[in-house]
Amino acid sequence: KSPIFGPEEVNSVEGNSVSITCYYPPTSVNRHTRKYWCRQGARGGCITLISSEGYVSSKYAGRANLTNFPENGTFVVNIAQLSQDDSGRYKCGLGINSRGLSFDVSLEVSQGPGLLNDTKVYTVDLGRTVTINCPFKTENAQKRKSLYKQIGLYPVLVIDSSGYVNPNYTGRIRLDIQGTGQLLFSVVINQLRLSDAGQYLCQAGDDSNSNKKNADLQVLKPEPELVYEDLRGSVTFHCALGPEVANVAKFLCRQSSGENCDVVVNTLGKRAPAFEGRILLNPQDKDGSFSVVITGLRKEDAGRYLCGAHSDGQLQEGSPIQAWQLFVNEESTIPRSPTVVKGVAGGSVAVLCPYNRKESKSIKYWCLWEGAQNGRCPLLVDSEGWVKAQYEGRLSLLEEPGNGTFTVILNQLTSRDAGFYWCLTNGDTLWRTTVEIKIIEGEPNLKVPGNVTAVLGETLKVPCHFPCKFSSYEKYWCKWNNTGCQALPSQDEGPSKAFVNCDENSRLVSLTLNLVTRADEGWYWCGVKQGHFYGETAAVYVAVEERKAAGSRDVSLAKADAAPDEKVLDSGFREIENKAIQDPRLFAEEKAVADTRDQADGSRASVDSGSSEEQGGSSR
């Protein structure tokens, strides 16, 4: 499939101009290669009309130009003084005409409307409101006012001042008489439909002295805005329908066959299953505008999207709408990453998150997608040393391994941790990736005591048992804090006896704290890694108390079977105030994020339930 993309259909009227934008992947080769616009012949072939190398056909002399915008990966063809002869099938493309790096465009130029003299033209968008003004003279002030629509040769009554309303206009039309002083009556039609377009006649009086005024109503179907995004990337649809629909339910739908438009998401709580975990509808502003973010773009997401407003939360005749044509470029710069990570209760996961490696200094974030209230993604951790309170001691974001990948480690897993998470940065907003954490049956691989109490001034030894399957891994102990996990010296105490059917390659590695102080209190992790790549971890909370009896402490696994330290999250932890990025610019626009970590809830972001790419978590 060609990665070139443009408008499938362009419609205009004789004498007008058109501007056609074509998109291409902005590789260095593509940026510098020839761009062209050609007309397809009946027997195949495509005759160049204009190219970026300066060629302009005589048919286009003085009325067309082609401009390349290499930084955007677009070029624009402008054609003026259109005639019906310009109607036809064209291609915009790169390289040589016959190579196939092109996109087919159909241009339709229609004749301008033949209007009667003194006709007022009203041009209004589909779903909007039109007010047709009808002047009259004093002698007709007390007489019947009416509006007719010309259907073929016959005028059909639409509305009149005696209370008649044509059934096609019921509930969306009114006739206003301004008071005799103004000598004007108005007909207001709401929720305009394409079928409302045509010639109208307004009339005051019924005899030969009646006042008449012709009106031509043109109802415009919105031209879709072209959107070109990378596979696995994200897209934001900004929908501004105007303050008159501020209190009406909003929706985003995707056109399927024919006129059907399947709801993707709406403000009434509906969401298509294919977008679970990877879509957010940002809250609407007072003016009724809102935006929808979709991440983890798939090939099948390509197509025409409409946003609109209707009390049903779906497209109906007369809904005001905005349209986009989304093209998903399969020649993506965004790397693949596992979309599913598995862990066991009590175990851990280490998630590798990709980011744009040109933006190594950007702030990295990890958030939990929540489906309620149209979707939201409250932050859990960032690379600046902030961790959401309920995750202290069990969540860490590491800049390693770096150069396009960062790591998020979450341990002490429970079934409540299952769900969709987003990796994102405050840099390139197209690089938002989604991972689903699944909690599966099994036991954690690493064995540590459940809770440990150290005595001030004494020595504490905490064991961590590693099964033999980790023999090729580096084993470590570290002390958790908001900015990561600082490595500590540890002792390899030889084979562990904690595992059945495990040979000499199992290991017992102990953490020793000498002369314990209050500062030693906190969370400690033992884990495995290979270089800068982190695997499984286990967490222990060390409490420090006053000396009761002399001697050092050596904690065994037997003591670990006591109830775990009560840092365990309570069942309602998701309802506790969420730390979140509230600034929707992080998700909605290509702008830096304001530091909003101390704001209340309301973040907006998005996720890829993606293919079944899987990365293991804790245990198999």
Epitope: P335, R336, S337, P338, A350, L352, P354, R357, E400, P401, G402, N403, G404, T405, N445, P467, K469, F470, S472, Y473, V528, Q530, G531, H532, F533, Y534, G535, E536, S611, E613, Q615, G616, G617, S618, S619, R620
Partner: nanobody, 117 residues
């Protein structure tokens, strides 16, 4: 089904070079970090090197740092290990593995590297 097939091993003199390859199939290769591990005769598994899915980040065990280079070609679904300045203690069976952080043991046959004069 995940399949990893190593090749490129052989007998080489100390100071010599070899390039190992690992052909991957059955999973989306570019999504995963990949690792090389080795096992000498009568020894446990030893980690050698690891590379991120996009190839941007690599790590090496101290014993091979400066001598070995890991790389990948995602278009060909292939992982490489360039081994220079080989020493007798590098003699081992070398395995490639998909990184999962779980201690999953290599399921492949491996390729034998023998460094001897």
């Amino acid at each position: 089904e995940v399949q990893l097939v190593e090749s490129g091993g052989g007998l080489v003199q100390p100071g010599g070079s070899l390039r190992l390859s690992c052909a991957a199939s059955g999973f989306t290769f570019s999504s995963y970090a990949m690792t090389w591990v080795r096992q000498g005769l009568g020894k446990g598994l030893e980690w050698v090197s690891i590379i991120s899915g996009n190839g941007g980040s690599t790590s090496y065990a101290d014993s091979v740092k400066g001598r070995f280079t890991i790389s990948r070609d995602n278009a060909k679904n292939t992982l490489y290990l360039q081994m220079n300045s080989l020493k007798p203690e590098d003699t081992a069976v070398y395995y490639c593995a998909k990184w999962d952080g779980l201690g999953t043991l290599p399921g492949s046959q491996g390729t034998q590297v023998t460094v001897s004069s």
